[in-house]
Amino acid sequence: MAVTACQGLGFVVSLIGIAGIIAATCMDQWSTQDLYNNPVTAVFNYQGLWRSCVRESSGFTECRGYFTLLGLPAMLQAVRALMIVGIVLGAIGLLVSIFALKCIRIGSMEDSAKANMTLTSGIMFIVSGLCAIAGVSVFANMLVTNFWMSTANMYTGMGGMVQTVQTRYTFGAALFVGWVAGGLTLIGGVMMCIACRGLAPEETNYKAVSYHASGHSVAYKPGGFKASTGFGSNTKNKKIYDGGARTEDEVQSYPSKHDYV
């Protein structure tokens, strides 16, 4: 029972984690304009892995994709690669783990095969989580470096009367989503690996034990794991949690005369 619960929980945690990694990768707010100790601008800048956006006080938001591949910083390319590898490994891991779940029967699949598949998916989840954490951390490091460089630039070259405000960027929401999601995927992977140990058949396999008592011969066959857990045949008491969250953008927009095409 504990093994199945561990496997099921590992799968769910990994599923949430991978969904988070996908969400983080797609999000535009990897870096957001630093508003602290900065003149109050009526324009808010934020950037993602795929495009940069500008939101005006009017509510008009313009996003521009990074249409160049060679012109992008190597670090950004590396982060993209890490996140994509994380998503791909996680997706494959999810696919494998579905078939490895103890509560799902596919033909006459042996427990040893399920154990191997559970271990494989667990390793994939661990690597996927590590890729996401590494990707987000590399981007965060890049931000910190650029932040202090731009801070230094803010106080230099101001001999003249005219000042140029340097836009500094700080951690965006996507970084935190990525870290949490990567951590969840990692934890899910570890749980799958733990479940794998419980799923693997014991080396000493007692097929049947005979007891001879008072002239009657009774053979006792130890029941398989399925018989003791209630999983396998009875799946009617599964609970499905369907949570939904809505967010509403509270920025102001402007009349139809300025509809952006």
């Epitope: 109050v40 324009v43 800048n45 940069s52 500008v54 509510g59 000042q163 402007y254 009349p255 005369k257």
Partner: antibody, heavy 118, light 113 residues
Framework: QIQLVQSGSELKKPGESVKVSCKAS????????MNWVRQAPGQGLEWMGW????????TYADGFTGRFVFSSDTSARTAYLQISSLKAEDTAVYFC???????????WGQGTLVTVSS | DIVMTQSPDFLAVSLGERATINCKSS????????????LTWYQQKPGQPPKLLIY???TRDSGVPDRFSGSGSGTDFTLTISSLQAEDVAVYYC?????????FGPGTKVDIK
């Protein structure tokens, strides 16, 4: 089409209060922020601030905090500018305007002349 | 606050001639995020509210004749009327639309010579 219609001229005594209204039509009122601009007789334009008509949050320019209050009534599709403890130097034409691309003031009301005289 | 200065204060140009108004801001109005300058130009005729002419320093608003053009970047901007018409007699204001508060320039009065 989009229109901003302001209340009529006001003649007030120093120390009194005035409430200028700006009724919007032709668009969803809560989607668009409302700005207020002052123009003293024969003078230039002075941006007073703006109100986010969705959240009700206001941003005031320096010199327009305290006596000046922006508000809005969603159901009436109207934005208000209230000035308390009026002074002679508050005599001006007050405009309401909505934001457009590039944070520009795209649509303007016709203006409301507030005269403060003893 | 950002200080906006305009030159000249008054400009008299013959009909059909070019009119050029300059505007300078105390800080750069260029946003690095989209490489756009948040500088707006307005036209105000006597007894009327101001009318939006140009936003993002060089983008004409819909319905604005193409004889009006804006240029410049950072702190120095220009509004050009390529061929002055009688209906162009007005006061022209530039405005910082990047930093709060949105400050206006003192205005340039354009008249016919």
């Amino acid at each position: 089409q989009i229109q901003l219609v302001q209340s009529g001229s006001e003649l007030k005594k120093p120390g009194e209060s005035v409430k200028v209204s700006c009724k919007a039509s032709g668009y969803t009122f809560t989607n668009y922020g409302m700005n207020w601009v002052r123009q003293a007789p024969g003078q230039g334009l002075e941006w007073m601030g703006w109100i986010n008509t969705y959240t009700g949050e206001s941003t005031y320019a320096d010199g327009f905090t305290g006596r000046f209050v922006f508000s809005s009534d969603t159901s009436a599709r109207t934005a208000y500018l209230q000035i308390s403890s009026l002074k002679a130097e508050d005599t001006a034409v007050y405009f309401c305007a909505t934001l457009g691309y590039g944070n520009s003031l795209a649509y303007w009301g016709q203006g409301t002349l507030v005269t403060v005289s003893s | 606050d950002i200080v906006m200065t305009q030159s000249p204060d008054f400009l008299a140009v013959s009909l059909g001639e070019r009119a050029t108004i300059n505007c300078k801001s105390s800080q750069s109005l260029l946003n690095s995020g989209n490489q756009k300058n948040y500088l707006t130009w307005y036209q105000q005729k006597p007894g009327q509210p101001p009318k939006l002419l140009i936003y993002w320093a060089s983008t004409r608003d819909s319905g604005v004749p193409d004889r009006f053009s804006g240029s410049g970047s950072g702190t120095d901007f220009t509004l050009t009327i390529s061929s002055l018409q009688a209906e162009d007699v007005a006061v022209y204001y530039c405005q910082n639309a990047y930093f709060y508060p949105f400050t206006f320039g003192p205005g340039t009065k354009v008249d016919i010579k």
